[in-house]
C-alpha cells in the first residue's frame, strides 16, 4: 500500500482550510478522549479510478468520497482519518485530513474526496473514514467502512495499468491444445516480443476429480527476435493411464519486468464424451 504522488495532496476547498498529513492510524483522540465529538460520515462511496504519476505511469487508485451529516456536530469536527486495509496481508495505510479552520453550515452539504491510495489488481480492501476526534470508549461510532475488490489484470481497463503491464498483461498467447494419437498433446501459443524463456506446465486429472494423476514440465528456450509474435508448437507425451484424460496446460513466461511472477495463461482439454452404451438386443424366439 502506498500513496500516489505524495506532494500533490490537497483537501482544502472553498470555506475550509485543510491539510493532508501522514497518519500512524492511531489518532491522538484514542489516547486522550474528548467530551464532544462529531457524528459519523454519510454516504461513503468507494470507486475504482485510474491516475497517472508525474512519470506517466498509470495506476489504479481508490477514489474515496463522503459527505457530512447536517447536524451541529460539525462545530466539533477537527478532521478525518482515512484508512485503507488490505485484507489478505493486514497491511494498513492511513492519512489524516486536518482542518485548519472551523466548519460552518453553508447552502451545500459538505463533501470530501481523496484519490491517492494506490491499490493492487485482484486485492480486496476495507476503506474506513473516521471523523476526528474519535468518540469516547462508550460513545456512538463516528466512522463508516466499505469493502472493495479490485479487478484482476484480465479486466479490460486494468490490463493497461502499469502494474498489470509489468506482469505481462498485454501478452495474449492464444493457446490451443489438441489431442493427438499415441497419448500426445500438441500445444501451440503465440510468443511475446521478448527474448525470454517459457515453461509449459501440464497437469492431468481423472474425469470429474481434482487430484492430479500426471504432471509434466516442459522448458521452452528464449526465442530469437525473428520468432517474436510467431506460434510456438510443442508436442507433449502423456502417461498412458486409463481415465487420466482431463489436461490443464499452463504457460508461464519469464519476462524481464516480472521474472518468475508473471501472469500465467492456461487452457484445459476435457475428457472425451463417453458414447451412450447401445441398448442390448433382447433374445427372442422366432415364431415359426
Amino acid at each position: 500500500l502506498r500513496l500516489l504522488d505524495h506532494r500533490a495532496l490537497v483537501c482544502s476547498q472553498p470555506g475550509l482550510n485543510c491539510t493532508v498529513k501522514n497518519s500512524t492510524c492511531l489518532d491522538d483522540s484514542w489516547i486522550h478522549p474528548r467530551n464532544l465529538t462529531p457524528s459519523s460520515p454519510k454516504d461513503l462511496q468507494i470507486q475504482l479510478h485510474f491516475a497517472h504519476t508525474q512519470q506517466g505511469d498509470l495506476f489504479p487508485v481508490a477514489h474515496i468520497e463522503w459527505t457530512l451529516q447536517t447536524d451541529a456536530s460539525i462545530l466539533y469536527l477537527e478532521g478525518a482519518e482515512l484508512s485503507v486495509l488490505q485484507l489478505n496481508t493486514n497491511e494498513r495505510l492511513c492519512v489524516r485530513f486536518e482542518f485548519l479552520s472551523k466548519l460552518r453550515h453553508h447552502h451545500r452539504r459538505w463533501r470530501f474526496t481523496f484519490s491517492h491510495f494506490v491499490v493492487d489488481p485482484d486485492q480486496e480492501y476495507e476503506v474506513t473514514v473516521h471523523h476526528l476526534p474519535k468518540p469516547i470508549p462508550d460513545g456512538d461510532p463516528n466512522h463508516q467502512s466499505k469493502n472493495f475488490l479490485v479487478p484482476d489484470c484480465e479486466h479490460a481497463r486494468m490490463k493497461v495499468t502499469t502494474p498489470c503491464m509489468s506482469s505481462g498483461s498485454l501478452w495474449d498467447p492464444n493457446i490451443t491444445v489438441e489431442t493427438l494419437e499415441a497419448h500426445q498433446l500438441r500445444v501451440s501459443f503465440t510468443l511475446w516480443n521478448e527474448s525470454t524463456h517459457y515453461q509449459i506446465l501440464l497437469t492431468s486429472f481423472p474425469h470429474m476429480e481434482n487430484h492430479s494423476c500426471f504432471e509434466h514440465m516442459h522448458h521452452i528456450p528464449a526465442p530469437r527476435p525473428e520468432e517474436f509474435h510467431q506460434r510456438s508448437n510443442v508436442t507433449l507425451t502423456l502417461r498412458n493411464l486409463k481415465g487420466c484424460c482431463r489436461h490443464q496446460v499452463q504457460i508461464q513466461p519469464f519476462f524481464s519486468s516480472c521474472l518468475n511472477d508473471c501472469l500465467r495463461h492456461s487452457a484445459t482439454v476435457s475428457c472425451p464424451e463417453m458414447p451412450d452404451t447401445p441398448e442390448p438386443i433382447p433374445d427372442y424366439m422366432p415364431l415359426w
Epitope: D43, Q45, L48, F148, L149, V150, E154, A156, R157
Partner: nanobody
Framework: EVQLVESGGGLVQPGRSLRLSCAAS????????MHWVRQAPGKGLEWVSG????????DYADSVKGRFTISRDNAKNSLFLQMNSLRPEDTALYFC????????????????????WGQGTMVTVSS
C-alpha cells in the same frame, strides 16, 4: 439507452425453485460487477447477492446463503439468480443493479454503490 430488464418472477409454492434473469444493454456489461437486491412488501431494500465482473467472486446475504446462486453470462449480457428451497419470507420485488465503479463492493454494504437499476420482477412464495 442503458437499461436492465428482469424476468422470471412469479407465484411459487414453498420449497420450490425459480430462476430470475436480468438482461443488460447500453453499457459494457462484462466490465462491471452486478448485484441482486430485493424489497419485501412494506419493507426497505435488502441486498441479496453480488458477483464480480468475471464471476471470480460471489457473495450472498446470510438469509439466502446455501439456497440462492448468482451467475452471469458476459457473452449474452445476462445476470441470473437461481433460487432454490424458496420460503414465504423470500416474497419480494427483486431488482438487478449495476455497480457505478469498475471495482466490486463486497460485504453487502453496497446499496448506494449502484447507478443503474431494473424495474424489478415480483416473486411470491405462498401455498
Amino acid at each position: 439507452e442503458v437499461q436492465l430488464v428482469e424476468s422470471g418472477g412469479g407465484l411459487v409454492q414453498p420449497g420450490r425453485s425459480l430462476r430470475l434473469s436480468c438482461a443488460a444493454s447500453g453499457f459494457a456489461f462484462a466490465d462491471y460487477a452486478m448485484h441482486w437486491v430485493r424489497q419485501a412488501p412494506g419493507k426497505g431494500l435488502e441486498w441479496v447477492s453480488g458477483i464480480s465482473w468475471n464471476s471470480g467472486r460471489k457473495d450472498y446475504a446470510d438469509s439466502v446463503k446455501g439456497r440462492f446462486t448468482i451467475s452471469r453470462d458476459n457473452a449474452k449480457n445476462s445476470l441470473f439468480l437461481q433460487m432454490n428451497s424458496l420460503r414465504p419470507e423470500d416474497t419480494a420485488l427483486y431488482f438487478c443493479a449495476k455497480e457505478r465503479s469498475l471495482g466490486y463492493c463486497s460485504g453487502g454494504t453496497c446499496s448506494d454503490a449502484f447507478d443503474i437499476w431494473g424495474q424489478g420482477t415480483m416473486v411470491t412464495v405462498s401455498s
